[in-house]
């Protein structure tokens, strides 16, 4: 059970950045999903390695004085989601605005019909372009 | 079947990153090979979880405009190579430079006899000491 | 056999990480333990993919001119300990300090009793927000 | 290239101390076990003390356990020996060497070694 998604650009204004089964992406079988293109949903029980990674673009004038963070969260059936995973990075001070690059990943146990998604600060400074931003995970 | 190799610094011009089996390095049978020093390739079909790191050292002022990116490419036989992940972080201002780390990691299929590599915007700006750089796969 | 362990602020004034089995934790089974509250220790012989990320807040004036390193070091029975891999990012210009994130994550083989832990070159500068600073293994 | 330069040696009488120095470059410091080694006149080789590359663990010769301790500050590349109640027998060139890494414990096998520094405990 395995997947590797791709980042989508959405005009939403939710945190939770949009994933799509496009370019070279993986989905094993499915016994994982991507539901809603926001969340992967696992059927099966089991410890799974969960990683995201996300190029954002920012301007520490243009943005506000709290840092980039990404969120890596679960949402377990019948419980309040929870942060598994968080990066932070200063915004830069290049002009217009400078690249950075964030990777999160672990071991965590899932139960079946969990759904683990990413959120980060300002969607409106991650980039898009070819393998720049992507997520998934494997079962162990 | 597994791999991580370590890099090695090169006098080649190529923007394709050099590595070696030396170090406390992986490989783990004659499944995975490192060809021509400069890629990992593969001999069977399968989910493989692959990843890169690079540090590197740059200055804004000593650099281009554009920021530093490190690409993790497959190759296919018969195929055009093809980006599969890639991370940008923008030059620091320390001087005379300032170092940055980058990690890229999925989980991507490949055909027998493909082949991955690293690919970064500037090779002379990479950091060799020990542990700095490193490249390597498993198969799930 | 896979942990996942989270980040504990240390009063103790050594380099080394301190972790506990806390929040989201994964502890599969006895054959990997946690010890001391610093190192991953295995029972078994095998090749393990292990990763930490440590997320740090520094400010380039109040800190050292060289710059944060995270090492991920192994210690074998009956031998020294070693360097696995090492991120290095330099510090930020933000004020009081600015957060940045270093992943870390390699294949390696590991003997029976082989402790995996990791250093860095200022614990007081390294975040324990929630999901902000991990460690972890699996094995293959 | 890896270059090992010891320093503060010097003459000194019995009982009394010394600190030597040795400054490390052109590898990675702190992924290194260091040892301190001397050649008394006219004599062989003789391991002295180990230190690991984090620091935290080290290793003596009976002859000088309770009186040497090494120590290493790896933000300066730079390993130390202290030598207090120095006694005639004490009298050698002490060289710094590096070791391999992950070496095995009792390993004494050294591929770079310093120029030396002397040590004199006479009265």
């Known amino acids: 059970i395995a997947a590797h998604v791709i980042s989508e650009a959405s005009s939403k204004t939710t945190s939770v950045l949009q994933w799509a089964e496009k370019g070279y992406y993986t989905m094993s079988n499915n016994l994982v999903t991507l539901e809603n293109g926001k969340q992967l949903t696992v059927k099966r029980q089991g410890l799974y390695y969960i990683y995201a990674q996300v190029t954002f673009c920012s301007n520490r004038e243009a943005s506000s004085q709290a840092p980039f963070i990404a969120s890596l969260c679960l949402k377990s059936p019948g419980r309040f989601e929870r942060i598994l995973l968080r990066a932070a990075n200063t915004h830069s001070s290049a002009k217009p605005c400078g690249q950075q690059s964030i990777h999160l990943g672990g071991v965590f146990e899932l139960q079946p019909g969990a759904s683990v998604f990413v959120n980060v600060t300002d969607p409106s400074q991650v980039s898009h372009g070819t393998g720049f931003t992507s997520f998934g995970l494997l079962k162990l | 079947i597994a791999a991580h190799v370590i890099s090695e610094a090169s006098s080649k011009t190529t923007s394709v990153l050099q590595w070696a089996e030396k170090g406390y390095y992986t490989m783990s049978n004659n499944l995975v090979t490192l060809e021509n020093g400069k890629q990992l390739t593969v001999k069977r079909q399968g989910l493989y979880y692959i990843y890169a790191q690079v540090t590197f050292c740059s200055n804004r002022e000593a650099s281009s405009q554009a920021p530093f990116i490190a690409s993790l490419c497959l190759k296919s036989p018969g195929r055009f190579e093809r980006i599969l992940l890639r991370a940008a972080n923008t030059h620091s201002s320390a001087k005379p430079c300032g170092q940055q780390s980058i990690h890229l990691g999925g989980v991507f299929e490949l055909q027998p006899g493909a082949s991955v590599f690293v690919n970064v915007t500037d090779p002379s700006q990479v950091s060799h000491g020990t542990g700095f750089t490193s490249f390597g796969l498993l198969k799930l | 056999i896979a942990a996942h362990v989270i980040s504990e602020a240390s009063s103790k004034t050594t380099s080394v990480l301190q972790w506990a089995e806390k929040g989201y934790y994964t502890m599969s089974n006895n054959l990997v333990t946690l010890e001391n509250g610093k190192q991953l220790t295995v029972k078994r012989q095998g090749l393990y993919y292990i990763y930490a990320q440590v997320t740090f807040c520094s400010n380039r004036e109040a800190s050292s001119q060289a710059p944060f390193i995270a090492s991920l070091c192994l210690k074998s029975p009956g031998r020294f300990e070693r360097i696995l891999l090492r991120a290095a990012n330099t510090h930020s210009s933000a004020k009081p300090c600015g957060q940045q994130s270093i992943h870390l994550g390699g294949v390696f083989e590991l003997q029976p009793g082989a402790s995996v832990f990791v250093n860095v070159t200022d614990p007081s500068q390294v975040s324990h927000g929630t999901g902000f600073t991990s460690f972890g293994l699996l094995k293959l | 290239e890896v270059q090992l330069l010891e320093s503060g040696g010097g003459l000194v009488q019995p009982g009394g101390s010394l600190r030597l120095s040795c400054a490390a470059s052109?590898?990675?410091?702190?992924?290194?076990?260091m040892s301190w080694v001397r050649q008394a006149p006219g004599k062989g080789l003789e391991w002295v003390s180990t230190?690991?590359?984090?620091?935290?663990?080290?290793y003596y010769a009976d002859s000088v356990k309770g009186r040497f301790t090494i120590s290493r500050d790896n933000s300066k590349n730079t390993l130390y020996l202290q030598m207090n109640s120095l006694r005639a027998e004490d009298t050698a060139v002490y060289y710094c060497?590096?070791?391999?890494?992950?070496?095995?414990?009792?390993?004494?096998?050294?591929?770079?070694w310093g120029q030396g520094t002397l040590v004199t405990v006479s009265s």
């Open positions: 230190i690991s590359p984090l620091g935290p663990d080290t």
């Open positions: 060497a590096k070791l391999l890494m992950g070496e095995y414990l009792n390993s004494r096998t050294f591929d770079y």
């Open positions: 052109g590898f990675t410091f702190e992924g290194y076990p």
